[in-house]
């Protein structure tokens, strides 16, 4: 009898107790494989769910979430409220990310900014609630002949660029040396 059941196609159910064993699934039910003993009730996409694919006698309905919500779980089993970028969903609703954290999506939690110094790099662009920090090249990458894998960033904030710091330090040293020699030269003139 089991072999007879396997002849029942998807869209039907099988009953070994009858001579004619295959029966069509009733409305709003389905069987996605052959030989099933019962038809499953179609999923209904109601409330925060909306129908992505209608149910048929051989496949279940598929749901999405209405605007302002996103799917969670296998086969969109739950809908969770969207938040803005720079926020995370808490039990009390959407809350801004704390300083030092960011979220660039409408879902999920706020994550800590990347710690550039752990990779021996410097901060090229500061982080925000919506965006992670951008790490720049390490000071070692600036030595002559060294090639940097990090492309130059289009925007650099003064005080954060190692190139500028290096340039200012060099300029200061040269100016100090010039002043030193000027002072010495002035003293020599006075002695004469």
């Amino acid at each position: 009898l089991q072999d007879l059941c396997s002849n029942c196609p998807a869209g039907t159910f099988c009953d070994n107790n009858r001579s004619q064993i295959c029966s069509p699934c009733p409305p709003n039910s389905f069987s996605s494989a052959g030989g099933q003993r019962t038809c499953d009730i179609c999923r209904q996409c109601k409330g925060v769910f909306k129908t992505r694919k209608e149910c048929s006698s051989t496949s279940n309905a598929e749901c999405d979430c209405i605007s302002g919500y996103h799917c969670l779980g296998a086969e969109c089993s739950m809908c969770e409220q969207d938040c803005k970028q720079g926020q995370e969903l808490t039990k009390k609703g959407c809350k801004d990310c704390c300083f030092g954290t960011f979220n660039d999506q409408k879902r999920g939690i706020c994550r800590p900014w990347t710690n550039c110094s752990l990779d021996g790099k410097s901060v090229l662009v500061n982080g925000t609630k919506e965006r992670d920090v951008v790490c720049g090249p390490s000071p070692a990458d600036l030595s002559p002949g060294a090639s940097s894998a990090t492309p130059p960033a289009p925007a650099r904030e003064p005080g954060h660029s190692p190139q500028i710091i290096f340039f200012l330090a060099l300029t200061s040293t040269v100016v100090l040396f010039l002043l030193f020699f000027l002072v010495l030269d002035y003293k020599d003139d006075d002695d004469k």
Partner: antibody, heavy 114, light 107 residues
Framework: QVQLQESGGGLVKPGGSRKLSCAAS????????MHWVRQAPDKGLEWVAY????????YYADTVKGRFTISRDNAKNTLFLQMTSLRSEDTAMYYC???????WGQGTALTVSS | NIVMTQSPKSMSMSVGERVTLSCKAS??????VSWYQQKPEKSPKLLIY???NRYTGVPDRFTGSGSATDFTLTISSVQAEDLADYHC?????????FGAGTKLELK
């Protein structure tokens, strides 16, 4: 919305042949089994044939077995009923319906008469 | 084959009256019975499936009940637009079979 539109009916002589079609739209045709059901003038409904979604399973009423052939073209969303050796008792309105038997077409009338 | 017997063959009712239509199966068909409404020159429309489930968009004055061999369609307060033939059918086993129908007429 779900729509089923039958065509191909008309006047046929006894012993003749005819092919009915049912054009489906508004649902995923390839995921549904389909039925043909007929209704003789001033009579009740009589189930004629069933074909599963993938054409692997076919059933016929005893009254049409060996004379009628049900088939489908999922690429064209169309159901067919090829009828041969027609008799006067085959005169009826022929309806196609999804296997849930929830939606029916408007029907196509077949008259078998000399 | 399972035989579905409907009674009465026809009935005349006044608007607002309660209508009860009967359908008996020659053998146990579980709850695999549907009721259809067919207006003159139109195709059948599904009202009730699974003996008691109202199909989408069907007014709640239509109620189905019963199981095994005895089934009933009740119209709690008949309206003028309910003038039609009513068919019961079983999908418990092939061949699917239908009753001869009950014609509902208005007085």
């Amino acid at each position: 919305q779900v729509q089923l539109q039958e065509s191909g009916g008309g006047l046929v002589k006894p012993g003749g042949s005819r092919k009915l079609s049912c054009a489906a739209s508004g649902f995923t045709f390839s995921e549904f089994g389909m039925h043909w059901v007929r209704q003789a003038p001033d009579k009740g409904l009589e189930w004629v044939a069933y074909i599963s979604s993938g054409s692997s399973t076919i059933y016929y009423a005893d009254t049409v077995k060996g004379r009628f052939t049900i088939s489908r073209d999922n690429a064209k969303n169309t159901l067919f009923l090829q009828m041969t050796s027609l008799r006067s008792e085959d005169t009826a309105m022929y309806y196609c319906a999804r296997d849930w038997v929830d939606y029916w077409g408007q029907g196509t009338a077949l008259t078998v008469s000399s | 084959n399972i035989v579905m017997t409907q009674s009465p063959k026809s009935m005349s009712m006044s608007v607002g009256e309660r209508v009860t239509l009967s359908c008996k199966a020659s053998e146990n068909v579980g709850s695999y019975v549907s009721w259809y409404q067919q207006k003159p020159e139109k195709s059948p429309k599904l009202l009730i499936y699974g003996a008691s489930n109202r199909y989408t968009g069907v007014p709640d004055r239509f109620t189905g009940s019963g199981s095994a061999t005895d089934f009933t369609l009740t119209i709690s307060s008949v309206q003028a637009e309910d003038l039609a033939d009513y068919h019961c059918g079983q999908s418990y086993s092939y061949p699917l079979t239908f009753g001869a129908g009950t014609k509902l007429e208005l007085k």
